[in-house]
């Protein structure tokens, strides 16, 4: 097991998850850790505890390894980091990778007020309701946006969008969470259509699928929990 020292001199590795950082309960996920070609061992940590290791074979590329989680559950949802060893030296920790498990317990209802088709500049509010008591709700927009909103609430939360612009159009779903990394089943999608303005933009974005695998976002924490952040498709965290 890696020993913490003040003399970690190797650059930190990059960590990412495929197909997504959001994984349906019982499904598999791959966590990739990319370090250096000279790496002799990679270690994966989960919530600060040693989770798994991989010693890359010289015949393969040694600068990255794949850790496979065969069945995502609430017990494997949370924060992952990785390290690598080269010679006697260990790297610094990667940035945290936050894996969320979805598809737990119950399905929330999502609706929009005053209606799903509104005119440009009209005030819109989304409501998310879950019969099972929960601590926090998340509203996510599919495709084309990295925006995640969260609100505290017991069985219902409201998400005021303010005066809408064309950027608000699209398909939304909400989740209730039992903790920051264990979420309910997704609500049925609600598509917000915006009409009016210079051009008629009432059409929703042409989206080939509403599968969770196509959502683009990263999960970042601040004092209030999860918040919006930008990410690219592989959900790689680096810098």
């Amino acid at each position: 097991q890696r020993i913490n020292t003040e003399k970690e001199t190797l650059p930190k590795p990059i960590i990412w998850a495929k197909p997504s950082i959001m994984v349906t309960n019982g499904n598999s996920v791959n966590i990739w850790c990319q370090g250096a070609q000279s790496a002799s061992e990679y270690q994966l940590y989960f919530e600060g505890s040693f989770f798994a290791l991989e010693r890359p074979k010289p015949s393969r590329s040694m600068n990255k390894v794949r850790f496979f989680i065969s069945q995502m559950t609430s017990h494997t949802a949370g924060i992952y980091t990785c390290f690598y060893q080269s010679g006697e030296l260990w790297s610094k920790s990667s940035n945290p990778l936050k894996l969320v498990v979805t598809g737990l317990y119950d399905t929330p209802n999502l609706w929009v007020y005053p209606r799903p088709e509104v005119t440009l500049g009209e005030n819109v509010t989304f409501f998310c309701q879950l019969k099972t008591a929960t601590s926090k709700f998340f509203l996510l927009k599919e495709r084309g946006s990295n925006h995640i909103q969260n609100k505290y609430g017991n069985i219902q939360a409201e998400f005021p969008m303010g005066p809408v612009t064309r950027a608000h159009r699209g398909t939304y779903r909400c989740f209730g969470s039992y903790n920051d990394y264990a979420w309910s089943f997704p609500s049925e999608p609600v598509t917000l259509l915006i009409t009016g303005g210079v051009e008629n933009s009432s059409l929703a974005p042409t989206d080939p699928t509403s599968s969770l695998d196509y959502w683009e976002f990263d999960l970042s924490t601040n004092e209030s929990g999860l918040q919006k952040d930008s990410a690219f498709w592989d959900h790689t965290t680096q810098n």
Partner: nanobody, 126 residues
Framework: EVQLVESGGGEVQPGGSLRLSCAAS????????MGWFRQAPGKEREFVAA???????YYAESVKGRFTISRDNAKNTVYLQMSSLRAEDTAVYYC????????????????????WGQGTLVTVKP
């Protein structure tokens, strides 16, 4: 569905040896990563040793040099050879599997394992 059945536990004197076996049902054994954990009375379950599907191994510091994990894919069985046993090795020993897995992943954390045996008791006393 994978079923794991441990055997080989018993009572042994300090310094003695035992070999635990874990027989797995099903044809997925070759694609499984395997591990041994133990739980002493009044303590939490702890990692002992693990082996990847490609035979890479890893041991807890407390057993390194004394215990050896191995597997026989033809017999769908993983073994834990324990020697130089000490009183502090007394515990219920559990076999666990990650099915399926990839390459030479070695799993150390109990949360990674999706199948568990019922356990076999090892008692080390004079």
């Amino acid at each position: 569905e994978v079923q794991l059945v441990e055997s080989g536990g018993g009572e042994v004197q300090p310094g003695g040896s035992l070999r635990l076996s874990c027989a797995a049902s099903g044809r997925t054994f070759a694609s499984a990563a395997m591990g041994w954990f133990r739980q002493a009375p009044g303590k939490e379950r702890e990692f002992v040793a693990a082996i990847s599907r490609s035979d890479d191994t890893y041991y807890a510091e407390s057993v390194k040099g004394r215990f050896t994990i191995s597997r026989d894919n033809a017999k769908n069985t993983v073994y834990l050879q324990m020697s130089s046993l000490r009183a502090e090795d007394t515990a219920v020993y559990y076999c666990a599997a990650v099915v399926p897995t990839y390459g030479s992943n070695i799993y150390v954390h109990s949360a990674a394992y999706n199948y568990w045996g019922q356990g076999t008791l090892v008692t080390v006393k004079p």
